[in-house]
């Protein structure tokens, strides 16, 4: 079903530069490049390069898309969970009775028992399941440092509710750094926000596993609905594979233009607005590294005999299970331009104009 | 250069129920389907299944993916920044000296000048610079609210640094509020982290635009550096273009599968594990709806005669700007998945499994 | 074809005025902004005045400011100096000139014939 | 305003040499500088414009570089028809200035 062309690269080049005319345009919204007519001579205003660099600044701070999911994320994540030690247990007794804290304990040896070595960890969750709550209370919950010391992990705002709801944390990190470490247990905090103005703040909320009076020793635990660690990671069996040569590589700039890749990958092209386009009309920049994916993405039929060997080209060639696999963009970045409208100077910044990687989808 | 050919659909679905049965081996690294030999009579176990639909129920709170963009975020946004109110303003009066806190004002007529509707506004970061810190320091961003009551927003745990460097927060919600309402100034407030416990948190970071006294009234303002807000926004004379009948759609399951579109879109295909791919040994769930998509995504040539009307067809068709556009999956969701291995029962997650949206890429 | 003809020049007296026409063709006009450009006999070049593309924004070099003033009809496709106050160091050839203001770099991308102008008594 | 100093006023090459005019600003002014050139009796003509770019249509043994307030204009192999005047001019801001120009004549 698949028909091979020699590939026509200058040909694909002029129809992405072409692609690209009608692209910015289109998200200009205007029907034809603006008149430079009524624009003052000599450089823009200092605010509206300022104004452009800030920008700027922000593209380079952070990419528009995700970056590429790590070859780990493709395969399938072994799911077990590990419940909070149960509140009889004395290391509770450490921890003063408050009111605006409850405490959950973890053996760390449960948790080793799952996920053996750090580096098979792909996404911990600590899970809660909150009773009803009468009024908003913003909580914090903190991870267990040295003795008694806290470190503050992430925050959430709870919304007043009459039924029970499952609340979920990200602790991947802290799980991670549990496993490299010799702790035989581990805790969370889970405190009421405490401003630096206000700090009579109760702890409202009712986690299913503490009583309202919030001693850990006095819960009555509901069965398995007591907190618990939801851990996702790749089984050591399965682990050895990933260091091995047939790993998924990142379709990126840094391996893509290194590289004699013919399969699908990220293609370097640099866009000069004047030479490339005849724009004369946008400032600022004078041109930007558009680049663009191709090379192809082979269908590969599971049915084939030498079925082991076929099943490791999935994570390349065809991760998406397509009928017809595509070599698409994957990080895409924006682009901020100045340009005059009349006599004045617009900075607009442009989404996903730049490619940084591409797959095969 | 593009060769219409008749899809016959019932080969592309054969395709991509073949492509799942490798993609589902790939993803378990496993080179056939695993023997069911030692496998108990009855059903799951409790705890198995309790993991399963602990599983499902992360999969129900959170995609994969990000949703698909919504039609405003394909056009360009105008950058516009609006500075702090200079500290010698009487509202820095109202707030009290503090070790624990800074306030910064804008003026809301300069937000509304730069961004007439709240609807418009794709993003505003509150931008601050940072001056050289010796001390890691939690901070905690606030809104004004009322009178004199704050809003807690965000929180940053700051690394010491010798040199200055720009902070910004998200605070896109909080304008569109200001944009909404009628007062006249609004307000932030940056302070310490104060746990419950350790209250006599002192704000370290020094944040140009204020005196290291920190009385806004006293602050020396280093040029253009002092805080501002950068705002990213739709322009009102291009907005009206939004509610248009050519808008973009979100080529997901709710539009896709209702309607007849011939191009680009989500199709719908239910796998039957036992009848699509003759395997027994998945034991949860039956099957699932995989989907996938099809449909063309036409090249647009910009130098078309009917130039604005090819212009509008970008965002839809190859608003990539692509050589070669493709129907390629946008939102993706995972799939858990119990099966045994030997007499053990196993909860995997598989990635990217369920197409609900698809793309022109 | 892209050209531009200028008109009007002339010999007149000192403290005289005159008014110099540039007609263009062969390019959309009011997109554009224009400009005079002007050479004294056996000297150098000297810009006089600009204006753009609407019409909306003149700029004058400090010898002619408040003697000369810059139009334009777009309808018609023209552009005008008015010259009042006239003075013999005037003299030169003007040239009319479209400007390329893209990026505010503002060069002279087409240029007239030039039209000489004598101020003497 | 900005006073913009063309050296040499005058220069006697010959056909094939290379050729170099340079232009100095009173003030920064990069990239806002254009060059052009002038014949007897005839109007100036575009060669370069923002420092270094080549206007369409004229010949690649002309290019501009330069940077701040110092510009030059380089021929790389002189032709016959290339013996003119040559003036810089700025755009940096109003009053747009020219430099005085070079002319170049024939050894």
């Known amino acids: 079903l698949s028909t091979c062309k020699t590939i026509d690269m200058e040909l694909v080049k002029r129809k992405r530069i072409e692609a690209i005319r009608g692209q910015i345009l289109s998200k200009l919204r205007l029907a034809s490049p603006p008149s430079q007519g009524e624009v003052p001579p000599g450089p823009l205003p200092e605010a509206v390069l300022a104004l452009y660099n800030s920008t700027r600044d922000r593209v380079a701070g952070e990419s528009a898309e995700p970056e590429p999911e790590p070859e780990a994320d493709y395969y399938a994540k072994e799911v077990t969970r590990v419940l909070m030690v149960e509140t009889h247990n004395e290391i509770y007794d450490k921890f003063k009775q408050s009111t605006h804290s409850i405490y959950m304990f973890f053996n760390t040896s449960e948790l080793r028992e799952a996920v053996p070595e750090p580096v098979l960890l792909s996404r911990a969750e600590l899970r809660l399941l909150r009773l009803k709550l009468k009024v908003e209370q913003h909580v914090e919950l903190y991870q267990k440092y040295s003795n008694n010391s806290w470190r503050y992990l992430s925050n959430r705002l709870l919304a007043p509710s009459d039924s029970p709801e499952w609340l979920s944390f990200d602790v991947t990190g802290v799980v991670r750094q549990w496993l490299s470490r010799g702790g035989e247990i581990e805790g969370f905090r889970l405190s009421a926000h405490c401003s630096c103005d206000s700090r009579d703040n109760t702890l409202q909320v009712d986690i299913n596993g503490f009583t309202t009076g919030r001693r850990g020793d006095l819960a009555t635990i509901h069965g398995m609905n007591r907190p618990f660690l939801l851990l996702m990671a790749t089984p050591l069996e399965r682990a050895q594979h990933l260091q091995s040569s047939r790993h998924r590589r990142a379709l990126d700039t840094n391996y893509c233009f290194s590289s004699t890749e013919k399969n699908c990958c990220v293609r370097q092209l640099y866009i000069d607005f004047r030479k490339d386009l005849g724009w004369k009309w946008i400032h600022e920049p004078k041109g930007y590294h558009a680049n663009f994916c191709l090379g192809p993405c082979p269908y590969i039929w599971s049915l084939d005999t030498q079925y082991s060997k076929v099943l490791a080209l999935y994570n390349q060639h065809n991760p998406g299970a397509s009928a017809a696999p595509c070599c698409v963009p994957q990080a895409l970045e924006p682009l901020p331009i100045v340009y005059y409208v009349g006599r004045k100077p617009k900075v607009e910044q442009l989404s996903n104009m730049i490619v940084r990687s591409c797959k095969c989808s | 250069l593009s060769t219409c050919k008749t899809i016959d659909m019932e080969l592309v679905k054969r395709k991509r129920i073949e492509a799942i049965r490798g993609q589902i081996l790939s993803k378990l690294r496993l080179a056939s389907p695993p023997s069911q030999g030692e496998v108990p009579p009855g059903p799951l176990p409790e705890a198995v299944l309790a993991l399963y639909n602990s599983t499902r129920d992360r999969v129900a709170g959170e995609s994969a993916e990000p949703e698909p963009e919504p039609e405003a975020d394909y056009y360009a946004k105008e950058v516009t920044r609006v500075l702090m109110v200079e500290t010698h303003n009487e509202i820095y009066d109202k707030f009290k000296q503090s070790t624990h806190s800074i306030y910064m004002f804008f003026n809301t007529s300069e937000l509304r000048e730069a961004v007439p509707e709240p609807v418009l506004l794709s993003r505003a970061e509150l931008r601050l610079l940072r001056l050289k810190l010796k001390v890691e320091q939690h901070v905690e961003l606030y809104q004004k609210y009322s009178n004199n009551s704050w809003r807690y927003l965000s929180n940053r745990l700051l690394a010491p640094s010798d040199s200055p460097e720009w902070l910004s927060f998200d605070v896109t919600g909080v304008v569109r509020q200001w944009l909404s309402r009628g007062g006249e100034i609004e307000g932030f407030r940056l302070s310490a982290h104060c746990s419950c416990d350790s209250r006599d948190n002192t704000l370290q970071v020094d944040i140009n635009g204020f005196t290291t006294g920190r009385r806004g009234d006293l602050a020396t303002i280093h040029g253009m550096n002092r805080p501002f807000l950068l705002l990213m926004a739709t322009p009102l004379e291009r907005a009206q273009h939004l509610q248009s009948s050519r808008h973009r759609r979100a080529l997901d399951t709710n539009y896709c599968f209702s309607s007849t579109e011939k191009n680009c879109c989500v199709r719908q295909l239910y796998i039957d594990f036992r009848k699509d791919l003759g395997w027994k040994w998945i034991h949860e769930p039956k099957g699932y709806h995989a989907n996938f998509c099809l449909g063309p995504c036409p090249y647009i040539w910009s130098l078309d005669t009917q130039y604005s009307k090819v212009l509008a067809l970008y965002n839809q068709h190859n608003p990539g700007a692509s050589a070669a556009p493709c129907c390629v999956p946008q939102a993706l969701e995972p799939l858990p998945i119990v099966y045994y291995v030997g007499r053990k029962p196993k909860v995997e997650q598989l990635s990217n499994m369920i197409v609900r949206s698809c793309k022109c890429s | 074809e892209v050209q531009l003809l200028e008109s009007g020049g002339g010999l007149v007296q000192p403290g005289g005025s005159l008014r110099l026409s540039c007609a263009a063709s062969g390019f959309t006009f009011s997109s554009y902004a224009m400009s005079w450009v002007r050479q004294a006999p056996g000297k150098g070049l000297e810009w006089v005045s600009a204006?753009?593309?609407?019409?909306?924004?003149?700029y004058y070099a400090d010898s002619v400011k408040g003697r000369f003033t810059i139009s334009r009809d777009n309808s018609k496709n023209t552009l005008y100096l008015q010259m009042n106050s006239l003075r013999a160091e005037d003299t030169a050839v003007y040239y009319c000139?479209?400007?390329?203001?893209?990026?505010?770099?503002?060069?002279?991308?087409?240029w007239g014939r030039g039209t000489l102008v004598t101020v003497s008594s | 305003d900005i006073q913009m100093t063309q050296s040499p006023s005058s220069l006697s090459a010959s056909v094939g040499d290379r050729v170099t005019i340079t232009c100095r600003a009173s003030?920064?002014?990069?990239?806002?500088l254009n060059w052009y050139q002038q014949k007897p009796g005839k109007a100036p003509k575009l060669l370069i414009y923002?420092?270094?770019e080549l206007e369409s249509g004229v010949p690649s043994r002309f290019s501009g570089s330069g940077s701040g307030t110092d510009f030059t204009l380089t021929i790389s192999s002189l032709q016959p028809e290339d013996f003119a005047t040559y003036y810089c001019q700025q755009s940096y801001s109003t009053p747009l200035t020219f430099g005085g120009g070079t002319k170049l004549e024939i050894k």
């Open positions: 000139a479209r400007v390329d203001s893209s990026g505010g770099y503002w060069y002279f991308d087409l």
């Open positions: 204006i753009s593309g609407s019409g909306g924004s003149t």
């Open positions: 923002a420092a270094s």
């Open positions: 003030q920064f002014i990069s990239p806002y």
